[in-house]
Interface confidence: low
């Protein structure tokens, strides 16, 4: 008789999850010499240990501490790029501007990017059928707690000028409920961070509005200023040209507004 299994509202664990995490770890440590010392089997064991046999609505940051310890990594603190609702462009940017880093350019972010996972209380099984949805089921689920933990640590590590890419096509350009708005903003360290510089990415080709005047951006500015961090904002009117100019800075068109 098959055991009764909790049905959650969200999609189940990504297929071949253990193999994917292990393969990503091996690939990352091969590409990044400073992480060559990492034992990927230990990383997987620590990852697994954070959620296996635990109720998937009762995960804590503490559960991830062994994984955090194994994945400790130093990135240049003044070259951090945060993003909100515009992941693809942020990643395209750091693929070209190799000295800047998003969270997903670090080992732990790379391992978990676009994956879903959860277990079941009191069994060693991974649940491939369903996992808790943040809104409909519970916020303390394995995926949400993981991203909250690594995002907090990433923001805490930042210094000098921190950049954030925001999606100017969304109704809330800055969303207080996003990971950026709820975690990263509040964990930037004022004693280390001079300025948060927002890049608002425009969607429409003919959109010449100054989205830095958007009420949600003003809200972000207010939150940041109250934390004794300077704020600045720039419109990126042509994201295609922006990327092109990062790739080919000598292009004569790159001295004009992007």
């Amino acid at each position: 008789v098959p055991r009764w299994r909790q049905q959650w509202s969200g999609p189940g664990t990504t297929k071949r999850f253990p193999e994917t995490v292990l393969a990503r770890c091996v690939k990352y440590t091969e590409i990044h010499p400073e992480m060559r010392h990492v034992d990927c089997q230990s990383v997987w064991d620590a990852f697994k240990g954070a959620f296996i046999s635990k109720h998937p609505c009762n995960i804590t940051e503490e559960d991830y501490q062994p994984l955090m310890k194994l994945g400790t990594q130093t990135v240049p603190c003044n070259k951090i790029l945060l993003w909100s609702r515009i992941k693809d462009l942020a990643h395209q940017f750091t693929q070209v501007q190799r000295d800047m880093f998003t969270l997903e350019d670090t080992l732990l972010g790379y391992l978990a990017d676009d994956l879903t996972w959860c277990g079941e209380f009191n069994t060693s099984k991974i649940n491939y059928q369903s996992c808790p949805d943040w809104r409909k089921d519970c916020s303390n689920n394995p995926v949400s707690v993981f991203w909250k933990t690594v995002s907090r640590r990433f923001a805490e590590a930042a210094c000098d000028v921190v950049h954030v890419m925001l999606n100017g096509s969304r109704s809330k350009i800055f969303d207080k409920n996003s990971t950026f708005g709820s975690v990263e903003v509040h964990n930037l360290q004022p004693e280390k961070v001079q300025t948060l510089e927002a890049w608002v990415i425009h969607g429409g080709r003919e959109d010449s509005r100054d989205l830095c005047q958007d009420p949600t951006i003003k809200e972000l500015e207010s939150i940041i200023s109250k934390r004794n961090i300077q704020f600045s904002c720039k419109n990126i009117y042509r994201p295609d040209k922006f990327l092109q100019c990062v790739k080919n800075p000598e292009d004569s068109s790159c001295t004009s507004e992007i």
Epitope: D160, H163, T195, E197, S232, K234, P249
Partner: nanobody, 121 residues
Amino acid sequence: EVQLVESGGGLVQAGGSLRLSCAISGRTFIADMGWFRQAPGKEREFQAGITWFGGSTYYADSVKGRFTISRDNTKNTLYLQMNSLKPEDTAIYYCAAGLKRIGDQREADYWGQGTQVTVAS
């Protein structure tokens, strides 16, 4: 490769103004730029910085309210407007590009040759 050429230095009376320029040639898409100065017998020190992307500006306490850094991307030029000059502002002024940390004079990818500013009392 980036070349930086400063101009605009010279002799000026105390209380006067000067505008320094730094012409940038070569690779122009560089993150942070700044102005530094070195007085005789002293270390080179940060005066003002600006980020390429957003144009955020930073100043040493000694020049806040008197100096203004700006840049014109269309002319590939960095500027330093210096007002209310004092004799202690006398120094060689250097333009720097690709600052690793704004305010840290030891780490920049590119430096100009410098331009002399002398403020007479």
